[in-house]
């Protein structure tokens, strides 16, 4: 009978046992265990009937299709085997083990005792069949093994071979190289590889095989296992293997597919191209006169670009456009892009206007083109080129016009300062009262009127200004200071205040220039109480035209002794101390108590010491500061009272032959005007020069040596 | 025509504020000063202080300068005078003056506990 | 703070005869810059704002009759009423405004 057992181990023993076996009995067990396994037997015990080729009593160990061994006996001789120590091993999860006794026993047997079980089978150790075995790394565990694969390969679908994801390889590059996976080592085995060149429309791909070539084939069919495929629209180049690389392949496409399939099995190193754009070409390019074309190549292709430049002075002209470059393409049907431009001269064409200056041209027919040269200058004798610039400026290469120092930035024209069209008087004896000013004399000269419209009725007064530039009047604090009913010190707004220059008659006006103020600023300083910093300026709406009536007067250096004592100033004004004259009568009146026509004295300036004793004799609160100075005479006299409030006090610079503002009529008295021993006061304008040119917004260095030359 | 128009009679305790209004008409409201003076029943007059609309700027009398406040809403031509902590004595009649020429007619004001 | 003295307290005046009136200031109201005296003269009539009537001590201000006539300078000045009329009646103040402005304090005027 036979008895099936599934167990992973388990005892087999003789019938009876440990008793003797009966005779004439044939019993079979059917081991069974699970895939993965295989099944050990050992005997612990084994006495059966000895008989030549174990002819009468035996055990017999098999698998479905393999006697394995046959026991009996009692010990092993030539013609009979007893199992002993040995154990049997099963090939696979199966075996059968049949015991048979004959029918007569000469003696009695104790029959056989005998244990089996189920062992791992380590397939990893064991699978010699290529076919079966794992592609890269065979993990083993009990009852089965899996495979796995290196870094950038995939386990295929059959659980064994190792492929690659390689069928999404795009190449848009004009040149390129392709390989099979792993190149040179031995490509993976059932895969499907998929390389894809785009190159743009008008390109055509040529493809040439490198190095080694070794796809697995067959000698008989042509490639079956492993290949290479080129399509090339509908057409199929291929399929290619074995050794031997295709000839270079011109493709007459700018679109290629490769198709490379491996199958599971095999070891070759596979293959490498290098693939290049052919492209059309385009006719050989002359360059333009005065010009050049990079790169200068013997054959231009498809998509090769050219750079159309011009020698220095020239600009490259293109459809009435002119540009420092030009580029053209070389297109896919072999023409190009673009006629090569021509080069022209550089024009820098008319140059900018310089206010207040002039332009001549230095090369003939006024040319503007490359090298040629213009020359500013100011219009003298009322302004003057700034640093002593030269004024030379050559058309560059880069169409503008260029001063070695300036660069492209024109020269500036600077008022002249401190120079009138009429010769001033240098030694007029003292005038009681003041004289007629010629027109031109003090061209520096501003009527300054203010009309506070805040209050009502509207509040007026002038004063007098000195003129500094096309654009600054310099006057004293107090004549734009706000007359608030505190003692805050507040300008006046700037819509409230009208500048007159050029004037000479007060009742005509007509040759006057009039501007309103931008900005009026006040030294921040300002004492309302002592006058101390009496300084001020006023921005004009626009730049006042120069001329022979209107100029400018120089400010002093900077030094805070001031003018000399002794020294002799001009004080010009319109004499203008009646206080019932409104500021009406004073701009459209002929009225007598004032002087219709400009007036000046010449005073001396006082020791320090000895206008500091004179107003401290005095009864009441004076203070003359180190920022003022004094002017006049001891025995008194008119004159010292003729400047209008903010007028310049000028001296003659002998070292610049130039008139300098060094003061401002600021205060004087309170005895009457012109009394014995009142000096007039007035602002030190050499301790102020700094904030001057700050206001203004020039560095000092800029203008000084207008009075210093 | 040119005028100034104030807002009407006030009775305030003692402690409390007091906001006079003054609508100008007929001139550039913005352009001109607009000045605060009282006048207490059967005295004189006393300046307060006085505004420039258009910028703002502000001048006190010293008396007042810790308890008057004026302020201008351009939008309105409107002066404003806000008096505070208030006491008998500030009992009077307070007029708008546009910079010295054009007088409100006044707002009475009674500071009574 | 300049103090502003007016005199007299009140004054009787006959209809058509001169009324005169003084104003004494504690410093004087002459600005050197604009050249002009800040002394204004306001007339108030019984229960009505003041009226301008004289600004920068002698301007008579547009409307005022011309029997207003204002003089003086530095620090002493006078409102004159040349012919005094019934309308007249009415309590004259001066008013410094050189610096932050103070008022005198008044002169009524009346009829004999």
């Known amino acids: 009978h036979t008895v099936e057992l599934n167990n992973m181990f388990g005892q087999i023993q003789s019938p009876g046992y440990p008793d003797s076996y009966p005779s004439d009995s044939e019993v079979t067990w059917n081991i069974t265990v699970p895939d993965g396994f295989r099944i050990k037997l050992y005997f612990m015990h084994f006495n059966l009937e000895s008989s030549y080729l174990c002819e009468y009593d035996y055990v017999k160990v098999e698998t479905e299709d393999q006697v394995l061994a046959t026991f009996c006996g009692r010990e092993t001789t030539d013609t009979e085997q007893t199992p002993g120590q040995e154990v049997v091993l099963s090939p696979g999860s199966f075996m059968s083990i049949t015991f048979r006794s004959d029918f007569s026993n000469e003696e009695r047997f104790t029959g056989f005792d005998a244990h089996y079980m189920a062992v791992d089978v380590d397939e990893c150790k064991e699978r010699e069949d290529e076919e079966l075995s794992c592609d890269h790394y065979c993990h083993n565990y009990i009852g089965g093994y899996y495979c796995s694969c290196r870094f950038g390969y995939i386990l295929h679908t059959d659980n064994r071979t190792c492929r690659v994801e390689c069928s999404d390889n795009l190449f848009t590059q004009r040149t390129g190289v392709i390989t099979s996976p792993d190149f040179p080592n031995p490509y993976p085995k059932s895969s499907e590889c998929l390389y894809t060149i785009e190159l743009e429309e008008g390109f055509m791909v040529n493809l040439q095989f490198e190095d080694i070539f070794d796809i697995e084939d067959h000698p008989e069919v042509p490639c079956p296992y492993d290949y290479i495929k080129i399509k090339v629209g509908p057409k199929v180049l291929g399929p290619f293997c074995g050794e031997k690389a295709p000839e270079p392949i011109s493709t007459q496409s700018h679109s290629v597919l490769i198709l490379f399939h491996s199958d599971n099995s095999g070891e070759n190193r596979g293959w490498r191209l290098s693939y290049r754009a052919a492209g059309n070409e385009c006719p050989e390019l002359q360059p333009p006169v005065h010009g050049k074309i990079e790169p200068s190549q013997a054959k231009y292709f498809f998509k090769d670009q050219v750079l159309v430049s011009c020698d220095t002075g020239y600009k490259v002209l293109k459809d009435n456009v002119e540009m420092d470059t030009f580029q053209i393409e070389c297109l896919k049907d072999g023409t190009w892009s673009n006629k090569i431009p021509t080069c022209k001269i550089v024009d820098c064409r008319a140059p900018g206007e310089l206010e207040h200056g002039l332009i001549t041209f230095s090369t003939r027919n006024n040319l503007t083109t490359y090298k040629s040269e213009i020359k500013y200058s100011c219009q003298e004798p009322y302004y003057k080129m700034l640093n002593n610039n030269t004024g030379i400026y050559t058309c560059s290469a880069q169409g503008v016009w260029m001063n070695k120092v300036l660069g492209r930035s024109l020269p500036t024209c600077l008022p002249e300062c401190g120079q009138p069209s009429r010769s001033l008087p240098s030694l007029v004896k003292r005038i009681i009262g003041g004289r007629n000013a010629e027109p031109g004399l003090f061209p520096w000269q501003a009527l300054i009127v203010v009309e506070d419209t805040s209050r009502v009725p509207n509040d007026k007064w002038f004063g007098s200004g000195a003129l500094l530039s096309a654009s600054w009047i310099l006057t004293a604090a107090h004549v734009l200071r706000s007359q608030r009913r505190d003692t805050t010190v507040i300008p006046v707004s700037k819509e409230h205040v009208t500048v007159y220059l050029g004037l000479h008659d007060v009742r005509d006006k007509s040759g006057a220039v009039n501007s309103s103020a931008a900005r009026v600023v006040l030294h921040p300083d300002f004492n309302i109480q002592n006058y101390n910093h009496d300084i001020a300026l006023v921005q004009l709406q626009e730049p006042v035209p120069l001329g022979p009536h209107v100029m400018p007067v120089c400010l002093p250096r900077l030094e805070p002794e001031g003018p000399a004592p002794h020294m002799l100033g001009l004080v010009a004004g319109w004499g203008i101390s009646n206080p019932n004259v409104t500021v009406d009568e004073i701009i459209s009146s002929g009225t007598r108590t004032l002087s219709d026509v400009l007036q000046y004295v010449k005073l001396p300036v006082v020791p320090h010491a000895e206008c500091k004793t004179s107003y401290e004799s005095r009864s009441g609160n004076y203070s003359v500061t180190e920022n003022m100075f004094c002017a006049g005479y001891y025995e008194g006299g008119k004159d010292t009272c003729l400047g209008d409030s903010g007028g310049a006090f000028v001296i003659f610079d002998d070292l610049s032959q130039r008139w300098v503002v060094q003061g401002l009529v600021s205060w004087g008295g309170p005895e009457e005007c012109g009394s014995k021993q009142v000096y007039g006061v007035y602002t030190k304008v050499s301790n102020y020069v700094d904030w001057v040119w700050e206001q203004m917004g020039l560095p000092q260095s800029v203008v000084e040596p207008q009075v210093e030359r | 025509q040119v005028q100034l128009v104030q807002s009407g009679a006030e009775v305030k305790k003692p402690g409390a504020s007091v906001k006079v209004s003054c609508k100008a008409s007929?001139?550039?409201?913005?352009?001109?000063?607009i000045e605060w003076v009282r006048q207490a029943p059967g005295q004189g007059l006393e300046w307060i202080g006085e505004?420039?609309?258009?910028?703002?700027?502000?001048d006190y009398n010293e008396r007042f300068k810790d308890r008057a406040t004026f302020t201008a809403d351009t939008s309105t031509s409107t002066a404003y005078m806000e008096l505070s902590s208030l006491r008998s004595e500030d009992t009077a009649v307070y007029y708008c003056?546009?910079?010295?020429?054009?007088w409100g007619q006044g707002t009475l004001v009674t500071v009574s506990s | 703070d300049i103090v502003m003295t007016q005199s007299p307290d009140s004054l009787a005046v006959s209809l058509g005869e001169r009324a005169t009136i003084n104003c004494k200031s504690s410093?004087?109201?002459?600005?050197?810059?604009?050249?002009?005296?800040?002394l204004a003269w306001y007339q108030q009539k019984p229960g009505q704002s003041p009226k301008l009537l004289i600004y920068?001590?002698?301007t008579r201000e547009s409307g005022v009759p011309d029997r207003f006539s204002g003089s003086g300078s530095g620090t002493d000045f006078t409102l004159t009423i040349s012919s005094l009329q019934a309308e007249d009646v009415a309590v004259y103040y001066c008013?410094?405004?050189?610096?932050?402005?103070?008022f005198g304090g008044g002169t009524k005027v009346e009829i004999k």
């Open positions: 003056v546009r910079s010295e020429d054009l």
């Open positions: 007929g001139y550039t409201f913005t352009g001109k000063w």
């Open positions: 505004i420039l609309p258009g910028s703002g700027s502000t």
């Open positions: 410093q004087s109201l002459l600005n050197s810059v604009t050249r002009k005296t800040y």
């Open positions: 920068w001590a002698s």
């Open positions: 008013k410094q405004s050189y610096t932050l402005p103070t």
